[in-house]
Every structure is written in C-alpha cells, then in structure tokens.
C-alpha cells in the first residue's frame, strides 16, 4: 500500500486572527487629514485634523497641542482670529481639506472648507523631540481677493489635493480641486492651479496660472482628485472622472495629469489615461479579451522599488513606480473578479508615453482627426492646433498648450486577483532591503502588509491584522514617520511599524525563520517573536524538526515496519536527500533505519501547501515491550539551509508495538487449481506495513486486511497434498502451525 502524508495548507503556518495592539490616538472626531514632520534634529510630529480642530502629536502619538480651526464665526476659533476682526464670510464648521508642509522654513499649512477655503500657515517650533505650532498666519489679503478672482481661495469643500514644491526659495502650491457649479460660483477656486506663497505669508500671489472645468460642463462633469505627488521634474495628479464629456457621466476612468515642477506654468499640462485590468491566467469563457477592466482608482502611492520587483517590471532598482488600487466602479462592488486590484506604472514609462503623445500631436505628419482633448478645460481642437483655433499661428507652439495623450497606459493586476474579496482603501509602498512591500488598509479596518511580487499564485504576507475592534474603513491618506506608518480609521490614528507589528502570527518555526530579515523574527521555543519579547530563548539560526503524523500507528513486535513520518523541517532541501548520520529515528527503544528517498515518488509540492515525508525501516529490539510508545526524530549536524539549519528533536505519541496472533484458518482444504478464499482470524493482523500469507511458500493474494481478519485467494498447488500455511507480518512469522490440503479439482 502507498500511504501519503496529508497536505498541510500553507495558511496553517500563520494565524491572522492574532491580536496586535499598536500605538493609537483618539482624535475626538473623524480624522479628515494627517501629515507628519521629521526635522533635522530628531524632532518629529504628527498633525491630525478633525472638524474644527487641529491636533499636534509627538512621535509617541501623545497630544502636544491642540488648535481650534472652527467653527468660523465662533470666538473660540484660533485660526479665524489670525485674519483679524470679521466678518469673513458665512459662519460654519471647518472641515480640513488640505494639510501640507511647506518645506521652506518649515511650516504647516492647513486649508479648510470655511472662510472661502483660505489657508493658514503655522511655523513649527521644536521642543525636545516634539514640535509646537506658532500662532497661525492668515494667508488671505482682503484687498486682492474678489468672488470672481480669489488667489487666496484654495480649498474646495468638495475636495482639494495640494503638493508643495520649492522653486528657488519660493514655495509653489500645486492645487487640484473638485468643483461643481455652486462651488465655482461662490468660492471661485480653480480645478488645477499653481500658486506662489508670498514671502511675507500674506497670501498667494495674484495672477496665478490655472485650468478650470468650463462653466457649461460644471453640472455634468465632475473630477475627483485622488492623489498628488512630486517626483523628478514633475508634479502629478491622479483623477477619477467621466471618460467622455458628451457620453454617460457615470462611465468613469482614471487619468494621470502631469505638470512641470520647475516652471510655474500650465502650457505643458498633460493627461494620460491609466488602464488597470485583471487578467486571470486561465480566462473564463465570456471574460473580456485583455482582461476585466478596473477603471476607477481608489488610492495610489508612488515609491522607489526593490530589486526583485524592479526585475519583474523590467526597470532598474530604486526607480520610482506609481502604484494604484483600482475597483470596477464608484461603489467598488463585486464583479466577476476580485474587489480590488493593484497595478504598477513605472514613472519613466509614464513620462515616455506622454512625450510620445506630444510628438504624435505636434510633429509632422500629424494623424488627421487626432484631437487635443481636455474639452472640459478648453475649446475643442485638432492636433497640432491650439485650443479653439483652426490653425497654428507662427508665434505659437503646439507644445505650449494642454494635451490629452491619445493612447492609454495599460497594466494588469500585480496580485493576479489574489486580493479576492478584500476592499483596499489605503495604500503606502515601501522598499525594505530588496523587497517592495505594499501596506494596505481595508474597508473592514485591517492592515495587510504584502510583498509586491508578480510571479506567484499566493500572497506573501508580512502581516494581516485588525487595527482595532471598530472595523471602520481605513482612510485613504497614509503618512510615514521614521520606521512607522500612520493609518487613520474612524476617529483613531494608528502607528504601524513598517517591518510589521510582530511575528506571533507565524505559527511554525520554519515559517518564522523564513520571514523577511527586516521583520526581526526569531523562534522562542514554541512561538515566533521579536527579540524583545523573549530575550532568553530567542534564536534565528535553527529549527527543530516537527512531526505532525506518522503511518502506520502500530507495528509488529517481531519483524520490520516501513514507517512514514510527516511534518516539516526534515530536510530544507527540495530533493529531500539526507546526509549520512544526520537523522535518527527511534520508536520506543528501537531504532528506525532511514531509507533512501525513492526518486520516482518525488512530486512537486506547491508552496501553497507544504509537507515533508521521511521513511525508515523499524526493526524492534529484542528488549522492546509490547504496548504504546513514542516516535522520536532527532536531527543533528545538518548543513544549513537558506534561512536556518534543522537541529533538534520532535516526539509524537501514538505508536504501538503489537504481537499478531493467528487463531483460526478456514477452510483448511481447497482445489489444487487454487482460488480458494481463505479466512485467517486472529488479533493485530493489520499491524505494520507488510504482511504475507504463504501456502507452501507461495503468496496467497490478499483481498482484504483488517485487525482481526485477513482474506486471501490460494495459489494453485503442485500436487494433491497437505502443505504448510504460515502468516508473516513485517517479514517475521506469526507463531502457530497450520496446514492447507490441496484436493483434486
């Protein structure tokens, strides 16, 4: 019989229900914005905005200072007071829409939904390792702001993204705001603008450059700005917006907008459609060619990538890549595939595609009918003409006007659909050693830290744990402070180590020591932990073998048993070859001689499952007693594997030595032609791994084996005669003298 060890699912080596408690801060209201500051002198801060309040936290998430930012018109509003005596507009709550650092001196800038979306500048003062905010400056000059032209009206109540760029010594605010007709009329913010902060912090310089959704499209064409960032020579905005100005406004797609970070102008404003798809390895019937589209960006982050992912993306290590989590629609509801997919867009490739798009529009020969696009911002035109013009005039350049690149950038889900039902709501990507890790927050308040790698059919988890008991969605914006990431969920801010919250979710020594080096996991006798958790017994260099099962569970006291051991950390080498003298198995007092691995039986084990098998021949010693005993596997002097060496002993109860007894055989005669069905009755007849009924030395073919009975068909006899009949278990004869009589047919 060929018994095989049962597979252990890979998931059994970890437990994602393990509770981790990470430092947190209760903000007293839904967290609306969060930003971190790290100074040159080891001082740092976390700024957390909720409705009508701005909290300053130390690096330990303890409150250092709190500032009232609203309601506007309330005498207790500390920021409002910086604008001098009012009234400054209708009273109302202040929802923070923008919270950014101006690196120049440095200072924190906050902009809210009240007071026409104006901003406040707070100088930072280090106090030890904490930071305080100076009295706010009101970035608003009454004399140059009008309802129709307001350089100091920055934030839209519908949402605003800001990236601050230093050019020379000036701070330029790259601002992108969602608009509708009502907001555009009352606030006069712009969709996209570049505003220079005046040196005296009296507001933003008038005459700034801007693009805005044209009034006729404001009702139907809404742009959501999901993310903004600055890398290299450009600032990028990521948007979700209707795919067409004229078609169904609910048919959305994702775009990347690129602006120059070196020149505060919008002539080289470019947009590119980002296309993210789920393309399963085996396409279902009826599934779309090229994969299922996931057109709506939910969250994004750009980061330099580690060596392994860089190789898979065919780019150099350390190059910047934009990662986006995409869903099928605004509600992110389930489709055929996973709820969320993650696509990677290398920035250099994005830039190349944009530049090629400009060439197609502006270099002869231009393909007839190629549109400049962005008809929601500017008058329609065909390339190479400027917006609204029939032809280029000699003193204008095709390149100096905004353009939608005619081709999209298409990528497929890095995770091959493995996120399944998970709805990702937050994303931050880091490079740790040569590994690229996606730190993701979810709709149900969990954090997933997963290696970004393309080629696998399972997820490589650093961790997967619940932030708290509320189960509230993790919010979009994530900040980094030193070796920690700050996630917000509901009214809480949580501080999660980039290396993961701990190691206790790894249940086996092997899984523990195979964890990434940066996690600092070690084995503590019977659990996986970090050194601080168990300083006495913590080690990272070896694992004992682990027996989980064996077969058979009993064997004869006389004769041999081929014992198959199941478990992990037997070999560390896929071949399962064992150097001489490294593995010692004893059953009770008896040794079990290791058997060479039968190479014909070697079969690939997918990483999703794991099991190791070890076979040995058990020959009980003469002193061995009948009854239950332990199986013990000791491994010593094994050469080290990639992650650790195997060393130690594993003991498992449940093996019994038994003495088979043959009590009766019937019938005791049969035809010489053979085929008589013999029934052998007794006790412990099924022990061990081999048994044979011999009729005159020839094997009687076993038809059924049970503890108390054997059935076999007699072989043909040479002559009519009485012949010896014996039972061997494990190659040893069971006591008793029996004969079988062959008769004429």
């Amino acid at each position: 019989e060929d018994w095989q060890c049962p597979r252990t699912p890979y998931a059994a080596s970890r437990d994602f229900d393990v509770k981790y408690v990470v430092p947190s801060f209760s903000a007293g209201g839904l967290v609306q914005a969060m930003v971190t500051y790290e100074g040159d002198r080891n001082e740092s801060a976390v700024f957390v905005a909720i409705r009508n309040r701005l909290h300053v936290l130390g690096p330990d998430l303890k409150s250092v200072q709190s500032l009232a930012t609203g309601p506007a018109g309330d005498p207790g509003c500390q920021t409002c007071a910086a604008c001098g005596p009012g009234p400054h507009g209708p009273p109302g709550d202040t929802d923070t829409k923008v919270l950014v650092l101006d690196p120049a001196l440095p200072a924190l800038v906050s902009c809210g939904s009240s007071l026409q979306g104006r901003c406040f500048l707070h100088d930072l003062e280090p106090q030890g390792t904490a930071v305080h905010l100076a009295a706010p400056a009101c970035l608003f000059s009454a004399h140059h702001n009008r309802p129709d032209d307001c350089p100091d009206c920055v934030a839209s109540p519908l949402g605003t993204r800001v990236t601050v760029v230093e050019q020379g010594q000036a701070s330029y605010f790259y601002v992108a705001s969602s608009l509708d007709a009502a907001v555009a009329a009352s606030f006069s913010p712009r969709s996209v603008s570049i505003r220079r902060l005046k040196a005296d912090a009296s507001g933003f310089a008038p005459g700034f450059v801007a693009l805005s959704v044209l009034p006729k499209h404001l009702v139907s064409y809404s742009i959501e700005y999901v993310h903004s960032f600055h890398t290299g020579a450009f600032v990028y905005f990521l948007t979700v917006q209707p795919a067409s100005v004229t078609d169904d406004p609910s048919a959305l797609h994702t775009r990347l907008a690129r602006l120059s970070a070196t020149e505060p102008e919008l002539g080289d404003y470019r947009e590119l459609v980002l296309d993210c798809r789920f393309a399963p390895k085996r396409r279902r019937r009826g599934a779309p060619e090229g994969g299922q589209p996931y057109p709506v960006l939910r969250v994004a982050h750009s980061a330099p990538v580690g060596a392994q992912l860089a190789t898979e993306l065919s780019i150099a290590e350390g190059q910047e890549v934009l990662f986006g989590v995409f869903v099928t629609g605004k509600d992110g509801g389930p489709g055929v595939g996973p709820n969320s997919v993650v696509c990677a867009f290398p920035i250099d490739l994005l830039d190349t595609l944009i530049d090629e798009g400009v060439e197609r529009c502006c270099e002869s020969p231009v393909h007839p009918g190629l549109r400049r696009g962005l008809d929601f911002f500017q008058s329609p035109s065909f390339c190479p003409n400027p917006p609204g013009l029939e032809a280029l005039s000699p003193n204008t350049s095709c390149r100096h006007f905004p353009l939608l690149v005619s081709s999209s950038f298409s990528r497929v889900d890095l995770f091959n659909g493995l996120l399944g039902p998970v709805q990702v709501t937050a994303l931050y990507v880091t490079r740790l050693d040569n590994v690229t890790v996606a730190h993701m927050g979810t709709m149900d308040g969990r954090i997933l830290q997963v290696e970004l790698v393309r080629s696998l059919n399972y997820l490589l988890y650093v961790s997967n744990f619940s932030l708290g008991d509320s189960g509230q969605p993790v919010q979009r914006d994530v900040s980094r402070l030193g070796d920690h990431l700050l996630f917000a969920s509901g009214d809480q801010v949580f501080q999660v180590p980039i290396q993961g919250p701990g190691c206790r979710h790894f249940l086996t020594c092997g899984r523990c020591l195979r964890a990434w080096h940066f996690m600092g996991c070690g084995w503590c006798g019977n659990m996986c932990g970090q050194q601080k958790e168990c300083p006495g017994s913590w080690q990272q260099d070896h694992c004992p073998p682990k027996l989980t099962e064996f077969h058979p569970h009993s064997g004869p006291l006389r004769g041999s048993t081929r014992l198959t051991l199941c478990g992990s950390n037997f070999y560390l080498h896929p071949s399962g070859l064992v150097p001489e003298g490294t593995h010692q198995v004893t059953v009770g007092q008896s040794p079990c001689r290791p058997l060479p691995k039968d190479s014909s039986k070697l079969r690939p084990v997918p990483r999703k499952d794991f099991v190791e098998e070890f076979e040995c021949e058990l020959e009980p010693l003469g002193t061995q007693a009948v009854g239950p005993t332990n199986v013990s596997l000791t491994v010593t002097n094994m050469p080290p594997g990639k992650h650790f060496r195997v060393d130690g002993t594993s003991v498992l109860r449940g093996f019994s030595f038994m003495e088979p007894v043959l009590i009766a055989v019937q019938p005791l005669f049969g035809p010489r032609a053979g085929g008589t069905c013999l029934t052998l009755e007794g006790q412990s007849l099924s022990v061990g791994t081999s048994r044979a009924v011999l009729v005159n030395g020839t094997e009687c073919l076993l038809a059924r084996v049970s503890e108390g009975q054997l059935l076999c068909a007699t072989p043909p006899g040479a002559t009519v005669a009485s012949v010896p009949l014996s039972l061997q278990v494990g190659g040893a004869q069971v006591p008793g003298s029996w004969t079988f009589q062959y008769r004429e047919d």
């Epitope: 001196l105 004399h143 040196a199 005296d200 005459g207």
Partner: antibody, heavy 120, light 107 residues
C-alpha cells in the same frame, strides 16, 4: 522696550572670517524671524537672509549663500551671522532686523548696525 | 529677483511742503511694499507697511498708497527732522529686495 543690540565695529584681514552678534530683548525672541541686511558705502541696502529662531530654518539670498551663515542661540536670545572668506567687497555696515513673517508685518525693529572693515 | 526702482534719487523741498516718493516694482506685488526712513548714521526705521498701513509712533504726516507695481510714500508737511534717505522694500518674493533710495533735502 524692544531692542536689538549688535556687536561693535570690526577691522579684519582679507581671507579671514568673523561673526557678528545681535542680542534681542524686550520681546519673545522665537516669535519673530531675524533678518540680516548689508548696507555698503554706496548706501545700497541688500537683504542677506533670515533665520527662524523658532526652528533654525533659514532662507538666504542666493547672492550671499556661502558668504554668510546664520545661526541662533535661543538660550541667550542672540542671533549670529558669520561672514566667511572676507574681501574688501564685504566692507559694509550689517544690520539685524526682526520680522514677523505674517501678513501684516514688516521689519519693525533694527539693530544699530555693525561696521565691518576688511583691510590688510 | 524683483527690482524696485525709486525716483527721484534726490528730492529737495521747503519745510511745510508736501512731498511724494515713488517706488516702481518690476512685477506686480499686490501691496507687499514697506517704507523705511534712515537718518544720517542711523538705522532704518519702519514708516509704512503693506503700502498704506500706518505704524504706531510714526507721525501722521506720513502716508502711503498704491498696489500692483506703483507705490507712493507721501509726507504732507515736511519738517526738518524728515531729512533722511527713504527706502522701499518688497516682501512679496524671495529674495527680499530694497529700492536704491531717495534722499530728501530741505531747502
């Protein structure tokens, strides 16, 4: 009463470096940025840069980067400007002036000036 | 850098007369202009901030106006103690810059 007391006149050799001090009193030193202004003999005023005593943040006029280094000592409410590799072009009166970098404020108090003569 | 051009270089007036100093910016700076007076061997003294805002302790005969690129400092009745150099300074953009100054002489 707000006062900015600067160190006395200096005669220094070409190639040398020197440090001018500006001791503030009568107000919260960390509450205002400290600006430094050069007035050469042609009466021209040139802004050198500022330092925020609050956090040590500095902004320099590109023209003076590498020539002037601004520092503060919060414990003594004193701002310093070090002038490096002096030449005859650096002979001038140097002023410190406080400025609240906020809408609505200008350089409202100035030191008495520190005269620097660079000569061999 | 923003260039501030002051004119004239020298103004000569009689006591009691009204006098105006001009400062023109090379680009629009809103009202981020400030005026200083510097008497002989003295330090600059702030007279007017943000183009037209008065400073406590400064006589009311000093006033300012303008926005964008053109700014004016006025003394509505000159006194002998007003003999000094007058400088404009912009705080709109880095680096902060000063005008070359106008010298006021009293006949």
């Amino acid at each position: 009463e707000v006062q900015l007391q600067q160190s006395g006149p200096e005669l220094v050799k070409p190639g040398a470096s020197m440090k001018i001090s500006c001791k503030a009193s009568g107000y919260s030193f960390t509450g205002y940025t400290m600006n430094w202004v050069k007035q050469s003999h042609g009466k021209k005023l040139e802004w050198i840069g500022l330092i925020n005593p609050y956090n040590g943040g500095t902004i320099y006029n590109q023209k003076f980067k590498g020539k002037a280094t601004l520092t503060v000592d919060k414990s003594s409410s004193t701002a310093y400007m070090e002038l490096l590799s002096l030449t005859s072009e650096d002979s001038a009166v140097y002023y410190c002036a406080r400025w609240l970098r906020r809408g609505g404020y200008a350089m409202d108090y100035w030191g008495q000036g520190a005269s620097v003569t660079v000569s061999s | 850098d923003i260039l501030l051009t002051q004119s004239p270089a020298i103004l000569s007036v009689s006591p009691g007369e009204r006098v105006s100093f001009s400062c023109r910016a090379s680009q629009s700076i809103g009202t981020s202009i400030h005026w200083y007076q510097q008497r002989t061997n003295g330090s600059p003294r702030l007279l007017i901030k943000f183009a037209s805002e008065s400073i406590s302790g400064i006589p009311s005969r000093f006033s300012g106006s303008g926005s964008g690129t053109d700014f004016t400092l006025s003394i509505n009745s000159v006194e002998s103690e007003d003999i000094a150099d007058y400088y404009c300074q912009q705080s709109d953009s880095w680096p902060l810059t000063f005008g070359a100054g106008t010298k006021l002489e009293v006949k």
